[in-house]
Amino acid sequence: MAFSGSQAPYLSPAVPFSGTIQGGLQDGLQITVNGTVLSSSGTRFAVNFQTGFSGNDIAFHFNPRFEDGGYVVCNTRQNGSWGPEERKTHMPFQKGMPFDLCFLVQSSDFKVMVNGILFVQYFHRVPFHRVDTISVNGSVQLSYISFQNPRTVPVQPAFSTVPFSQPVCFPPRPRGRRQKPPGVWPANPAPITQTVIHTVQSAPGQMFSTPAIPPMMYPHPAYPMPFITTILGGLYPSKSILLSGTVLPSAQRFHINLCSGNHIAFHLNPRFDENAVVRNTQIDNSWGSEERSLPRKMPFVRGQSFSVWILCEAHCLKVAVDGQHLFEYYHRLRNLPTINRLEVGGDIQLTHVQT
């Protein structure tokens, strides 16, 4: 389904990070934290849902620890005092590996999914509507933090146009340190006019939200592949597209296409059989010149999760993978608003798409 009126994402924020949750937590709000656990000696990171920036009042402290075989601590801090810890002895994160961490706020609890799999439920100890800030700290690098407010309409068929999303703007720079890691672009380009988050049915008949039933997260949600959706308003400078997923263990290739009518304005084609990331444009069924150069090694790995952030600028698309700038692609089809369709196919499982 589409999520409408959503706060725009924080893109590649530096850690430690604190940012406002516009409107505070609401029943049905889904917050996705996408990043990579650092390989460094640090053994912990934390995501906090808190009141204000002081850290004295944390409704939900989610704290993976790479200690004693690995476990995750969940807790609440009120007026500077911690309550009893809830520990989950399974560790779903790996050092050096990207992750997709999703928090769904519901009336009774937080549901936490890691890489598309339900990991833990944390029952509210304080009223969640007091929360107005998210903070992340510790041994982690962030690609993005996105926010999804549920619509009260059923999910659209996979290949239909997604409902229109209300205008949103990139938020003001949050408090706290906001220096960019090297190789990542500015976090707050010009205002975005629409953001649509695509989530999917986990099984026939099951929906994330209906007017009567509170939204629910199901294990192993999977996007239909190939996944095709409309980019409302097409491309324009400052437009961002975010995708995350997992490369299948036996993957040969996958592709992300930005299309204009019958033409493929931008074809992003990681090829594991060639150890290459090929970029091209197809006009009238005719391919142009391939671009393959990369500033570092192939960033996609079989069996591993990834995030791709495509930022449209006036003259080019900037593409970052797992929060690190990878390449620029000068527009070849330059009538940007007509580039209004996203197609994803090949040997991956998608977990998150935001257009």
């Epitope: 097409g234 324009y236 033409h263 006009i283 009238d284 142009g288 010149s289 671009e291 006036a314 003259h315 080019c316 000068y330 527009h331 070849r332 089809l333 330059r334 009538n335 940007l336 608003p337 007509t338």
Partner: antibody, heavy 120, light 107 residues
Framework: EVQLVESGGGLVQPGGSLRLSCAAS????????IHWVRQAPGKGLEWVAR????????YYADSVKGRFTISADTSKNTAYLQMNSLRAEDTAVYYC?????????????WGQGTLVTVSS | DIQMTQSPSSLSASVGDRVTITCRAS??????VAWYQQKPGKAPKLLIY???SLYSGVPSRFSGSRSGTDFTLTISSLQPEDFATYYC?????????FGQGTKVEIK
Amino acid sequence: EVQLVESGGGLVQPGGSLRLSCAASGFTFSQYAIHWVRQAPGKGLEWVARIYPDSGYTYYADSVKGRFTISADTSKNTAYLQMNSLRAEDTAVYYCARPYHQYAEGMDYWGQGTLVTVSS
Amino acid sequence: DIQMTQSPSSLSASVGDRVTITCRASQSVSRAVAWYQQKPGKAPKLLIYSASSLYSGVPSRFSGSRSGTDFTLTISSLQPEDFATYYCQQYYSPLLTFGQGTKVEIK
């Protein structure tokens, strides 16, 4: 037969404004980008701006950004270049041009040009 | 912006000569280069697009080639009507840029 005809050139004082027109015929106007290219006396070609009439999407050279506005009226098959805050260095013959293919940038059809002189 | 450095700025040649004009791009522009011919008081005419594709109706004595960021326009046997100014243009970047021009004069 494809034709592009520019008009609207003339003498204008520095800081003044002028609007050029480019009347197109012989092809489906909305399907092709329209470019403005200028040539100062005795100098080379300089690309100025481009518009896609179907969407209204535009690009500008840095030298004119914020001063010039390109627009198009698909009902009249005409593109315009509104030039404000004109400077002496904007003196040139202004051509409108169309690419040889809907998705190309090499320009095969050009107007005859219209002279803009910025002088006090 | 991508700069297109054209050389020479002018040359003198005779009818029947082989003439070569070069354009160097300040960065990679793939094959996104066109060549134009312009005569005094006239609008430019498209000769070559995509670095080496001959535009319809252009005589086959004109040819284009690419080596990395260097682009060449060759006139295999100069004809009287070829005396003109020639421009290269890159369209890899949406901000189009032209070379400074090469004037081909009668020796």
